[in-house]
């Protein structure tokens, strides 16, 4: 799991209730106007539009990504930017706004009739980070599920994990994604930290399977911080 | 549509700990953008208590619990928690699990803002000597 920058906030001094929200039991609570960030020592007055701090996509909502917000910023400092309508620059689906995708570089248009023919090809260009799609999270790079008949076995180009069979999962491979096996117990993984490491990896390993996570092997305790090794083991 | 149920609640002393689970069922709750706790104490309107990412890496608290509640999920039992500690009177509430699908747009405020969540029916604690 990700340690977020946002990791355990106080949200202090909510404000008075708006009054009820339709369909809920109760009112509404309005949002925090301070937030402790931690190490710090005074709350933070925020607003609707400060920068959303995150470490990968499905942090951000569905009209952003996450990215740094500078060309060739600090990898360490990403935050969730507005999403690229059609015709703009991009680098990976994610980059897209909801009913588009990355295509050679540009967000062009997913209407399925022009979609269809390339998804091949588009999929070979995906240099997104995918934890995304990692458990079945609906993501916009996307692929309608109508066009898959058959989900894809090991080995088998994919943009999301929902386009895996069962046990697999959809990871990096070089530039491309493809089905590879969920982990088990003992297996070595991937423990991401904040720095856009994430981001950087050629061959993406799976998650952990259901009720492992991915921890510091027991007798690497002692190691250094850079050479610890990190195993599925039990909850 | 999701399903939320509440457990866990009771009576409890000063001091003492409860944890409360919530489990949600008909969806999964790593569909699910956020995982909330809120809670309506006697007479007053509901308040946002705690709330956790879908990455388990964000996790929110109201000023009021901050150190003595943990907010945490287990996305392979499809289940919530709220731990308890240090329990005080003034805690004395219907607690509420709630789960709020992905924004648009991501904010803080968007974990503490009540009618981005579906809800569950709530379960009482009540911190009395």
């Known amino acids: 799991t990700l340690n977020s920058v946002l990791n355990s906030n106080a949200i202090k001094n909510l404000p008075p209730p708006l009054g009820g929200a339709a369909g809920h039991p109760g009112s509404a609570v309005s949002a925090a106007p301070g937030i402790l960030y931690p190490g710090g020592n005074k709350y933070q007055t925020i607003d609707n539009y400060q920068p959303y701090p995150c470490a990968e996509d499905e942090e951000c909502g569905t009209d952003e990504y996450c990215a740094s917000p500078t060309r060739g910023g600090d990898a360490g400092v990403q935050i969730c930017l507005a999403c690229r309508k059609r015709r703009k620059r991009c680098m990976r689906h994610a980059m897209c706004c909801p009913g588009n995708y990355c295509k050679n570089g540009i967000c062009v248009s997913s209407d399925q009739n022009h979609f269809r023919g390339e998804i091949e090809e588009t999929i070979t260009e995906s240099f997104g980070n995918d934890h995304s799609t990692l458990d079945g999270y609906s993501r916009r790079t996307t692929l309608s599920s109508k066009m898959y008949h058959t989900k894809g076995q090991e080995g088998s180009v994919c943009l999301r994990s929902s386009d895996c069979a069962s046990g697999l999962c959809c990871a990096r491979h070089f530039w491309s994604k493809i089905c590879k096996p969920v982990l088990k117990e003992g297996q070595v993984c991937t423990k991401h930290r904040r720095k856009g490491s994430h981001g950087l990896e050629i061959f993406q390993r799976c998650y952990c399977g259901e009720g492992l996570s991915c921890r510091i092997q027991k007798d690497h305790h002692q190691a250094s911080n850079s050479s610890r090794l990190h195993t599925c083991q039990r909850h | 549509e999701v399903q939320l149920v509440e457990s866990g609640g009771g009576l409890v002393q000063p001091g003492g700990s409860l944890r409360l689970s919530c489990a949600a069922s008909?969806?999964?709750?790593?569909?699910?953008?956020?995982m909330g706790w809120f809670r309506r104490a006697p007479g007053k309107e509901r308040e946002f208590v705690a709330a956790?990412?879908?990455?388990?890496?964000?996790?929110f608290y109201a000023d009021s619990v901050k150190g003595r509640f943990t907010i945490s999920a287990d996305n392979s039992k499809n289940t919530a928690y709220l731990q308890m500690n240090s329990l005080k009177p003034e805690d004395t509430a219907v607690y509420y699990c709630a789960a709020a699908p992905r924004p648009k747009r991501a904010s803080v405020q968007y974990f503490s803002t009540s009618s981005n969540y579906d809800w569950g029916q709530g379960t009482l604690v009540t911190v009395s000597s």
């Open positions: 956790i990412s879908r990455s388990g890496g964000t996790t």
């Open positions: 008909g969806y999964t709750l790593k569909n699910y953008y956020a």
